[in-house]
Amino acid sequence: PEPPTACREKQYLINSQCCSLCQPGQKLVSDCTEFTETECLPCGESEFLDTWNRETHCHQHKYCDPNLGLRVQQKGTSETDTICTCEEGWHCTSEACESCVLHRSCSPGFGVKQIATGVSDTICEPCPVGFFSNVSSAFEKCHPWTSCETKDLVVQQAGTNKTDVVCGPQDRLRA
């Protein structure tokens, strides 16, 4: 056999020889020879490798630092990293979720379009005509103005995007 110039999937070329890669969850101890296969060892506690590899060191599991508002969503294994998420009321500042910030509140005149999750912030929307929000909230949607007519009342003060209409009794015709 001629010395290889390329190797099969899950192999790597070293010293004109194709060696088996280490499986996920294991690290490389020594390259193969023509007499012995690649020597691999399992990653230690709190370490992982998630691909077929020739790494001599495993990666450390991510630490979900409670001081940064983080908590463990999914514990890491020898083949997967730990997944962090944020404490209630907080959300990740990036896709990697390395720190958290408090969910934003929607100011008066704005309502919650989408409630925040551990990985996404609150989405606010302006209250359209006929709706209002008079509080700063991370949960409240825009509320519809009160319908004075259904209460047999009349609008005494028009509503805005921050205030409800004010209803009052209908004026009585004098005799």
Partner: antibody, heavy 117, light 107 residues
Framework: EVQLLESGGGLVQPGGSLRLSCAAS????????MSWVRRAPGKGLEWVSG????????YYADSVKGRFTISRDNSKNTLYLQMNSLRAEDTAVYYC??????????WGQGTLVTVSS | DIQMTQSPSSLSASVGDRVTITCRAS??????LNWYQEKPGKAPKLLIY???SLQSGVPSRFSGSGSGTDFTLTISSLQPEDFATYYC?????????FGQGTKLEIK
């Protein structure tokens, strides 16, 4: 037809030296890793040493490291084992073998080395 | 070095018998194991490589199985020419090491 023929065995005193040869034929010698394996009287097989193809590395069992040297001459299709500082426990039949995919697929008939005073 | 322990050390059986020889590694070697047959005055012969693959030209009555630390060589129906000594050999760690052998004798 693949053939491996060992020679160079014999009786030697403790502390002495011997050089074993293995003449290969019937295949492209330079393309294969080769090894030496021995079997002591009444004992099992023991892998002694190996040499890679294409000028590859050399490897030894701990029991012979520093005393034995494996080499090859691809122009002569010959494998060698230089054995120095021989001990009584090195007494054995020595086989040369061809390696393919981590297995020894062809073996010679062996040559007897006796270390005794 | 990895220690390879074969059992039994010797075995008496009759032609037609099904025979199993086991080999245990002192640490995991995945499926990096070969089996050899040796007859008196003859060179050893490779039977099985990579724990379960039959070497070209070897009769199909020979089979191998196992991974990790425990391996077996099975001869489904013993033939007169199968009486010999059998060795396992690991290649998961340097240096390669053999088991002590199992001598298969005629009952």
């Amino acid at each position: 037809e693949v053939q491996l023929l060992e020679s160079g065995g014999g009786l030697v005193q403790p502390g002495g030296s011997l050089r074993l040869s293995c003449a290969a034929s019937g295949f492209t010698f330079s393309s294969y890793a080769m090894s030496w394996v021995r079997r002591a009287p009444g004992k099992g097989l023991e892998w002694v040493s190996g040499i890679g193809s294409y000028g590859g590395g050399t490897y030894y069992a701990d029991s012979v490291k520093g005393r034995f040297t494996i080499s090859r001459d691809n122009s002569k299709n010959t494998l060698y084992l230089q054995m120095n500082s021989l001990r009584a426990e090195d007494t054995a039949v020595y086989y040369c073998a061809r390696y393919v995919n981590f297995g020894m697929d062809y073996w010679g008939q062996g040559t007897l080395v006796t270390v005794s005073s | 070095d990895i220690q390879m322990t074969q059992s039994p050390s010797s075995l008496s059986a009759s032609v037609g018998d099904r025979v199993t020889i086991t080999c245990r590694a002192s640490q995991s070697i995945s499926s990096y194991l070969n089996w050899y047959q040796e007859k008196p005055g003859k060179a050893p012969k490779l039977l099985i490589y990579a724990a379960s693959s039959l070497q070209s030209g070897v009769p199909s009555r020979f089979s191998g199985s196992g991974s990790g630390t425990d391996f077996t060589l099975t001869i489904s129906s013993l033939q007169p020419e199968d009486f010999a000594t059998y060795y396992c050999q690991q290649y998961g760690r340097n240096p390669p090491t053999f088991g002590q052998g199992t001598k298969l004798e005629i009952k």
